[in-house]
């Protein structure tokens, strides 16, 4: 099955202090490799979450990504602040053996717009 990364929402509005969910689903888990969330594009983009089990303040995965056939890599950002505004991309990588992981597909991006409370 062809790999497709889908972020169904182009944009979400969230009041400062509230939580928001950024949705991301895959059509396939192959090739083997991680899924990572970034804010922004290009060399200056910021890694937000990588489903690697490490603790990231205010960010949680929505579903159990350790389950065998899980295709849902959505995240919840809590206590949103104006600094969280930007475009978030869900990106699938192919695992490298000795070389770095290769970026192979991305969702179309979800714009997070933070409203004053």
């Amino acid at each position: 099955k062809e790999l497709k990364v889908t972020q169904p929402e182009k944009s979400v509005s969230v009041a400062a202090g509230d939580s928001t969910v950024l949705n991301c689903t895959l059509t396939s888990l192959l090739p083997v490799g991680p899924i990572r969330w970034y804010r922004g594009v290009g060399p200056s983009r910021l890694l937000i979450y990588s489903f690697a089990g490490e603790y990231v303040p205010r960010i949680r995965n929505v579903s159990d990504t350790t389950k065998r056939n899980n295709m849902d890599f959505s995240i919840r950002i809590s206590n949103v602040t104006p600094a969280d505004a930007g475009i978030y991309y869900c990106v699938k990588f192919q695992k490298g053996s000795s070389e770095p992981d290769t970026e192979i597909q991305s969702g179309g991006g979800t714009e997070v717009y933070v409203l004053a409370k």
Epitope: S11, S13, V41, Q105, S106, G108, Y113
Partner: antibody
Amino acid sequence: DVQLVESGGGVVRPGESLRLSCAASGFTFSSSDMNWVRQAPGEGLEWVSLISGSGEITYYADSVKGRFTISRDNSKNTLYLQMNSLRAEDTAIYYCAKENNMYRFFDYWGLGTLVTVSS
Amino acid sequence: ETVLTQSPGTLSLSPGERATLSCRASQSVYTYLAWYQQKPGQPPRLLIHAARNRAAGIPDRFSGSGSGTEFTLTISSLQSEDFAVYYCQQYYDRPPLTFGGGTKVEIK
């Protein structure tokens, strides 16, 4: 059938203001993100501004930021572009464009309205 | 900002010939690329989205390909109504949404 009809263009002097309108029909206007795209005479396309379906989210090209304001009235199915402090380089045909529901490309365009800024 | 560069600027061909138009992005936009056709005095019309998906009502002589930074629009056999200006647009890196400078397909 989707229809977008722009109006409000005309000839103005530098520094003056103009308000463009775009009347929409044939789709659920309030759930569609809308854009203005312009085209200077004999030139290519330049994205100007975007507004989300609810009107909460707006974005502008750097070239118009602080001078242009995009807005919408979902009860009237109408999109607006308030253009202040107009410059000669704003002379262009202004198109109203409907975005695809899931991605930011334009599936429908209006016929455009010509704005000429000249002293 | 992602810059799109279209080439050639002008393509002079005869009806029935194959047209190959190129669009290059300054950084990867994956497959988040659209193509539009514009005839004189008319607004642009969507031809292709997601790099290769034809919009509703677009004849199958139009096809798109590519991903990442290199994209191609191919018109397999030019018809008289295909002579126009063609623009690519990326919708991955935004705002701003950016367009290429256009390729004019003219009758030789």
